[in-house]
Interface confidence: low
């Protein structure tokens, strides 16, 4: 399997934004790459977001996606927004080299994202 | 050495308060117990706080201590207050059975406490 590296731990900002880099060791010269972010919590795995991009171009997530990202060579800079404390969990980066063949799949070990909900600001009198 | 258990990870609240349980497997019937919290960061170990208590009585930390706690049997519920992001680190629970002899010492594997500084509230006009 293709090697995918990502940080072990990331703390979301108090605004609920977490960013991390997902880096893959490409065995071939891919032109089309698909990146998927999976969340594992209590051993349940759910897809958070996914984007397919052409090497050298921007990542395009769906308009209603909580993810944004940029790519640079074999690195993808991912940002997840709108996180709440209940979203704390292991966020796994899955990278697929879609074209040209052969197809390669790599799964990172996951980035544990910790989110703390902010205290509400006091009402202004 | 006496076994001491503590959680692997704790998130401080947005008010900078972190609580965790330190549980020890007492080989004997101790009446006097000393609990010390150590912080390890960048391989530097510093003492955060310490308290000696009689079994069945409350833990008493110094007045200016950032720690408070309660005990129940072989469990100590520790709370550390006033934490800032720079205080993120590994907090190790050290338990000593002081009396009666023999003396026992146990050191936990540490609780990684993550602290995120809150966003400042907007100025009220």
């Amino acid at each position: 399997a293709m090697h995918v590296a990502q940080p072990a731990v990331v703390l979301a900002s108090s605004r609920g934004i977490a960013s991390f880099v997902c880096e893959y060791a490409s065995p071939g010269k891919a032109t089309e790459v698909r990146v998927t972010v999976l969340r594992q919590a209590d051993s349940q795995v759910t897809e958070v977001c996914a984007a397919t991009y052409m090497m050298g171009n921007e990542l395009t997530f769906l308009d209603d996606s909580i993810c944004t990202g940029t790519s640079s060579g074999n690195q993808v800079n991912l940002t997840i927004q709108g996180l709440r404390a209940m979203d704390t969990g292991l966020y796994i980066c899955k990278v697929e080299l879609m074209y040209p063949p052969p197809y390669y799949l790599g799964i990172g070990n996951g980035t544990q994202i910790y989110v703390i909900d902010p205290e509400p600001c006091p009402d202004s009198d | 050495a006496m076994h001491v258990a503590q959680p692997a990870v704790v998130l401080a609240s947005s008010r900078g308060i972190a609580s965790f349980v330190c549980e020890y497997a007492s080989p004997g019937k101790a009446t006097e117990v000393r609990v010390t919290v150590l912080r390890q960061a960048d391989s530097q170990v510093t003492e955060v706080c310490a308290a000696t208590y009689m079994m069945g009585n409350e833990l008493t930390f110094l007045d200016d201590s950032i720690c408070t706690g309660t005990s129940s049997g072989n469990q100590v519920n520790l709370t550390i207050q006033g934490l800032r992001a720079m205080d993120t680190g590994l907090y190790i629970c050290k338990v000593e059975l002081m009396y009666p002899p023999p003396y026992y010492l146990g050191i936990g594997n540490g609780t990684q406490i993550y602290v995120i500084d809150p966003e400042p509230c907007p100025d009220s006009d």
Epitope: S43, Q44, I107, N109 | A5, A8, V21
Partner: antibody
């Protein structure tokens, strides 16, 4: 040391509710999960569901509509309720501590690391 | 649901033999696999977790290997107390499912 003990009625009538209790010692209910598993006579193991340390539950889809798992931290007890039982629910029922083993990457691998001795339940009129 | 196919379903061997049991998942389970030993009338006992990691107190003659969908439990030199039924279990998303078991008998 870690111990789990299942208890409950050995005989339940069809259409009634099966209620089992798992009493645990040697570990904290606030740090670990607990799974229920059953084994029909002469057959393999079937995972029923779990309750996580934070109270989160998850059930086998085929049993989801009939299963409730809860815990009473003060009594160190977990309970399983299975409604509308039939002869197909005749089995030995086990509870098992559910542990996440973490590595440097913070990637959690789960296992049922300690089991109760099991309690036999027959559904018959 | 992920299906776990264990083989063989039964196996006869002698003390001192090297024995291999395999488990195949219907999809990639990323090493989220545990192996258990169950003796007649007793509860299962965890042998290995994360496919290759030996649980505390389990003899080193037990080992695990594999990745993706294919996993193996090996007993390097069978001892009399090893004759039992062995189950694999995936823990990659729920429902956690078990293999159907391999009964290891004395030849």
């Amino acid at each position: 040391q870690v111990q789990l003990q299942e208890s409950g009625p050995g005989l339940v009538k069809p259409s009634e509710t099966l209620s089992l209790t798992c009493t645990v010692s040697g570990f904290s209910l606030t740090s670990y999960g607990l799974s229920w598993i059953r084994q029909p006579p002469g057959k393999g193991l079937e995972w029923i569901g779990y309750i996580w340390y934070d109270g989160n539950t998850n059930f086998h889809p085929s049993l989801k509509s009939r299963v409730t798992i809860s815990k009473d931290t003060s009594k160190n007890q977990f309970s399983l309720k299975l409604s509308s039982v039939t002869a197909a629910d005749t089995a030995v029922y086990y509870c098992a501590k559910t542990e996440g083993h973490y590595y440097g990457s913070n990637y959690g691998y789960y296992a049922l690391d300690y089991w109760g001795q099991g309690t036999s339940v027959t559904v018959s009129s | 649901d992920i299906q776990m196919t264990q083989s063989p379903s039964s196996l006869s061997a002698s003390v001192g033999d090297r024995v291999t049991i395999t488990c195949r998942a219907s999809e990639n389970i990323y090493s989220n696999l545990a192996w258990y030993q169950q003796k007649q009338g007793k509860a299962p006992k965890l042998l290995l977790y994360a496919a290759t990691n030996l649980q505390d107190g389990v003899p080193s003659r037990f080992s695990g290997s594999g990745s993706g969908t294919d996993y193996t439990l090996t007993i390097s030199s069978l001892q009399p107390e090893d004759f039992a039924t062995y189950f694999c279990q995936h823990l990659w998303g729920t429902p956690y499912t078990f293999g159907q078991g391999t009964k290891l008998e004395i030849k």
